[in-house]
Structure formats: C-alpha cells, structure tokens
C-alpha cells in the first residue's frame, strides 16, 4: 500500500516517501522507486538552513555599508550572513536591515546602558547628587563634587546639569 505519511526528514510525493535534502543542499530531483532524492550543494553566497525540498537556495543577506551595516558572521551553505552596525550605530530591527546613529543623552541625563550593535543607548535622569553637563552616548551622571573633602564649602548648589561650586570657608575674624 502506498504511504499516506512519511518519517521525519522525508516528504510524500507520487505516493512514495522521499528523503528531504540536508541543510546546505537543494533538491535536483525527487526520488523514485529506483533512485534516492538527488540533492546538490548550495553555491557560493547561498544557503538553506533546514532539511528541505527547495529547488533554489536562498541568497546570503548583503550587509550594505551604505546603510551602516557590516558582517558580524559570514554565512555558510547552512546559515545566513548575520549583519551588525558600524561603530556608533545600531540596528533598527531584529532583522538588522538598516542602522541608525546611537542616541546621545542630553545634559541632565546620563548613560544607563551603552548602546550595542543591536540596541540603542539607554538614558536615565541624573538623580539628586549627580549631574551631566554634556550631550553624550557614553557619559554617565557624575556625582557632585564633595566640597567638604576639599575643606571648602558649597558656594553654588549643584543641579542635574551642573556641578556644585565650592569656595573657601568664611574666616572667623
């Protein structure tokens, strides 16, 4: 009796079970009662990442430098190329099809997490006792200067954007 279902890594065609092509190979011809499935390796810059019956391999992804992309991991006959972004840029999506410049944290905000090739800068407001007076993708909030440790006194209070201003203590006459 002809089969109605096939084993894993097989497919049903013309009332018989044929072996799927292994990752890295494409289908040339279906099996017969006399021959096995005929498969051929994918060409240069092509891949197939599953057991398959595809007659064409997929093209490796192109990491377009004009979009700020570069190759993170070169593709093989079984895997696609993985793109990432140039230094200072990050992917706009999980597929990493284009890049945008890392965001800078404005004065009053510090970097909580530095951006990576796949995630943007995460900023946080500088809490009391900390400040940031620059727009930066790297600088964290800095603590206000401790005037006391320098034997000085606060002459001007700090804010989230400015450091305290220290000055000499008033002399007792």
């Amino acid at each position: 009796e002809p089969p109605t279902a096939c084993r894993e890594k097989q497919y049903l065609i013309n009332s018989q079970c044929c072996s799927l092509c292994q990752p890295g190979q494409k289908l040339v011809s279906d099996c017969t009662e006399f021959t096995e499935t005929e498969c051929l390796p994918c060409g240069e810059s092509e891949f197939l990442d599953t057991w398959n019956r595809e007659t064409h391999c997929h093209q490796h992804k192109y990491c377009d430098p004009n979009l700020g992309l570069r190759v993170q991991q070169k593709g093989t006959s079984e895997t696609d190329t993985i793109c990432t972004c140039e230094e200072g840029w990050h992917c706009t999506s999980e597929a990493c099809e284009s890049c945008v410049l890392h965001r800078s944290c404005s004065p009053g905000f510090g970097v909580k997490q530095i951006a990576t090739g796949v995630s943007d800068t995460i900023c946080e407001p500088c809490p009391v006792g900390f400040f940031s007076n620059v727009s930066s993708a790297f600088e964290k909030c800095h603590p206000w200067t401790s005037c006391e440790t320098k034997d000085l006194v606060v002459q001007q209070a700090g804010t989230n954007k400015t450091d305290v201003v220290c000055g000499p203590q008033d002399r007792l006459r």
Epitope: V28, S29, C31, T32, E33, F34, T35, E36, E38
Partner: antibody, heavy 117, light 107 residues
C-alpha cells in the same frame, strides 16, 4: 518464493527487433518497480531500463533511449523489453530485477541476446 | 554520469583470510550504494544495501561501510562459497551505474 523468469532472447541481425519478457511470481507484482540489467561477455553489468510499479514512469540510459521500450502488464505479472534497431554492442545476457527499497533485491536467471550478422 | 571505480580488479585469497573491497564514486553519493555478489554461472544477488545495511539471509561475515565517495565491502574470514565477482551500484542519480567488479578468487 520470489521468482523472475526471463525469455525471448536469441540471435538476431543488426537493425532487427526483439521482445524480451519477464514472468514474475511469489510477490505482489504491481507493488514493485522493475529494471532490466544486462551483462556483457566481460562480466560488466549495465542498467538498461526501469519501470515504476504502476507503469506510468519509465527510465532509460542515453545509449538505449529511443530504441528500447520497457512496459508491463500487471494483470499478467509480466514485464517486457521491446528492443529495436539492435546493434552488436547490445549483445549480452539480459536480466530483469525487482526494485525493493531502491535495491535490485531479486534477479532472474537471464536470457541471452546476440546481435550479429 | 557517476562512475564507480572498484579495486582491486582481482583479489586472490585463501579461505580464512579477511578482505576489503573498495568502491570509489566520481562524485559524492551519500550512502546511496548497494553491493552485489555474483557466483560463477549464477545471477547477481543483493549483499548490502545503503552502503552498510545488512540483508536477511546474507551471512554476518559480510559488512559494508563508507559514505560520500569511498565505500568498502569487508568479508571477515572468507569461505569457499564466497568466491565470485562483487559489484557496487549507485542509486544516487540517473543513470544507475555499476562498478566493473572485483573478482575474488582462490589463491
């Protein structure tokens, strides 16, 4: 017991035709593909033709394509090989062989074909 | 076409010897190879399928190995009834092709 019996061989002149038969028994004939394989005097084996279980698909090597025709009558449990435009290089012992799991798992005893002027 | 090259052409052995017969394919055929034995004045018979799978009724001294392009048929302790010609056959693609055979003979 699986049995394949070839017949129809003989001596013919170049350009002539000949029809070989293969009578099958001991298994469900209509469930199996069958092939013809020939063996030359130097003992080399050469695949000649194959036909699917239902008879809807046939396969030939280039050197016999257009000259040989494989066919089957499932109701009669019989396989045929119609050979035409025979050449001296077709001289051989012709076997029919059953295809089981893509292997030629049972062979007949062969029938001899000689093409000579 | 896939060409199968068998070696040696002839192998002269004494019963009790263990032997290895080689079959090399001109291109990769995975494990899509069968072995046949043909004794004098007999039809070929299937010995090993899919390069290494045993066949019911075939003595366990026969074994097959290999994948890709290089295949081996091994006979562990040859018996007198083993003399004859051994053929490999590929079924990876059309046309089906056979090796020219290795003749196993008595030394």
């Amino acid at each position: 017991e699986v049995k394949l019996v070839e017949s129809g061989g003989g001596l013919v002149k170049p350009g002539a035709s000949l029809k070989l038969s293969c009578a099958a028994s001991g298994f469900t004939f209509s469930n199996y593909g069958i092939s013809w394989v020939r063996q030359t005097s130097d003992k080399r084996l050469e695949w000649v033709a194959s036909i699917s279980s239902g008879g809807d698909n046939t396969y030939y090597p280039d050197n016999v394509k257009g000259r040989f025709t494989i066919s089957r009558e499932n109701a009669k449990n019989t396989l045929y090989l119609q050979m035409s435009s025979l050449k001296s290089e077709d001289t051989a012992l012709y076997y029919c062989a059953r295809a089981g799991e893509k292997a030629m798992d049972y062979w007949g005893q062969g029938t001899s074909v000689t093409v000579s002027s | 076409d896939i060409v199968l090259t068998q070696s040696p052409v002839t192998l002269s052995v004494t019963p009790g010897d263990s032997v290895s017969l080689s079959c090399r394919a001109s291109q990769t055929i995975n494990n899509n190879l069968h072995w046949y034995q043909q004794k004098s004045h007999e039809s070929p018979r299937l010995l090993i399928k899919y390069a290494s799978q045993s066949i019911s009724g075939i003595p366990s001294r026969f074994s097959g190995s290999g994948s890709g392009t290089d295949f081996t048929l091994s006979i562990n302790s040859v018996e007198t009834e083993d003399f004859g010609i051994y053929f490999c056959q590929q079924f990876s693609s059309w046309p089906l092709t056979f090796g020219a055979g290795t003749k196993l003979e008595l030394k």
